[in-house]
């Protein structure tokens, strides 16, 4: 495919990435799928600057990001290393809380109303953010 040089309509550019901010809610898996269908992924926060940028755009609203531990360890959806990467958890989080009564623990990460992160039940219908890198090849066939 050809290399993407500018962001799609309704996406916001920041530091060579494009971001799309939902205004409705979906379960984490549905949000993840939505981003994949857009040739993107749920947002992967790699720095303090990116955290502040996303936080500015989403406001004080619970919003899914591309971080989960559904298979054991915490993983970013694009393969970015979790252990050495940026983290912004609320105090005492993540806690894999079972007391919500919805079955299981909490396996998906979201931005809370103050921007810090929390783990929550993946089925909750939160807003979400998609991200795609400008420098990666798009899946669209090249124009002949």
């Amino acid at each position: 495919g050809s290399e993407r040089t500018c962001c799609p309509v309704n996406w916001v550019e920041h530091e060579r990435s494009c971001y799309w901010f939902s205004r409705s809610g979906k379960a984490w898996a549905d949000a993840d799928n939505y981003c994949r269908l857009e040739d993107a992924h749920l947002v992967v926060v790699t720095s303090w600057e990116e955290q502040k940028f996303v936080q500015h755009h989403i406001g004080p609203v619970n919003t899914w990001m591309g971080l989960h531990d559904q298979n054991g360890p915490w993983k970013w959806v694009d393969g970015t290393d979790y252990e050495t990467g940026f983290k912004n958890w609320r105090p005492e989080q993540p806690d894999d809380w079972y007391g919500h009564g919805l079955g299981g623990g909490e396996d998906c990460a979201h931005f809370t109303d103050d921007g810090r992160w929390n783990d929550d039940v993946c089925q909750r219908p939160y807003r979400w953010v998609c991200e795609t890198e400008l420098d990666k090849a798009s899946q669209e066939p090249p124009l002949l």
Epitope: W48, K52, K87, D113, G115
Partner: antibody, heavy 117, light 107 residues
Framework: QVQLVQSGAEVKKPGASVKVSCKAS????????FHWVRQAPGQGLEWMGW????????NYAQKFQGRVTMTRDTSISTAYMELSRLRSDDTAVYYC??????????WGQGTLVTVSS | DIQMTQSPSSVSASVGDRVTITCRAS??????LAWYQQKPGKAPNLLIY???SLQSGVPSRFSGSGSGTDFTLTISSLQPEDFATYYC?????????FGPGTKVDLK
Amino acid sequence: QVQLVQSGAEVKKPGASVKVSCKASGYTFTGYYFHWVRQAPGQGLEWMGWIHPNNNATNYAQKFQGRVTMTRDTSISTAYMELSRLRSDDTAVYYCAKDGRSSFDYWGQGTLVTVSS
Amino acid sequence: DIQMTQSPSSVSASVGDRVTITCRASQVISRWLAWYQQKPGKAPNLLIYAASSLQSGVPSRFSGSGSGTDFTLTISSLQPEDFATYYCQQANSFPFTFGPGTKVDLK
């Protein structure tokens, strides 16, 4: 112009607490994170944590968790840093700093805290 | 935590000299690095942010470069007021960490 003015020097005994203030002017106080950094005599700079004046969220360096509390009073555009259970190695100049783009773009003048019995 | 190292730890130079200070991060920090100047008894003063952007009001003889793990601060022509200690700082992830400093003094 942006200004951060800190409270005066303090002398404390080991085990006591100290509360340093930092009054901001020249910009929207609630719009930017506030950081606290300290510097022991003749030593380098050490980040202690941040507070966001808009929502009171905090993030403390692990080294200081359980001993530091960062607060703010938006009505007077002032941030506070309280450090408890003081030890002699907490003797340092404590700075507040405004968050900038991948940096601390404005700093207070510093507050010397001396811990001595 | 991300460790920051600086070299040299001190440098003796004369007015008009070109001075280069390097900073290395123990892991990749993209370009999220700042440089500060500190004089005795004073607070640090921001010179460079985002590795290469000059802070407003800072003379153009100061410049920064690098990304990833290796960064450089250059003073193209040292002036009398530039004798000070210089610190790098990573602003990529918590806890934010500083280099140990480089003291620039008169030869």
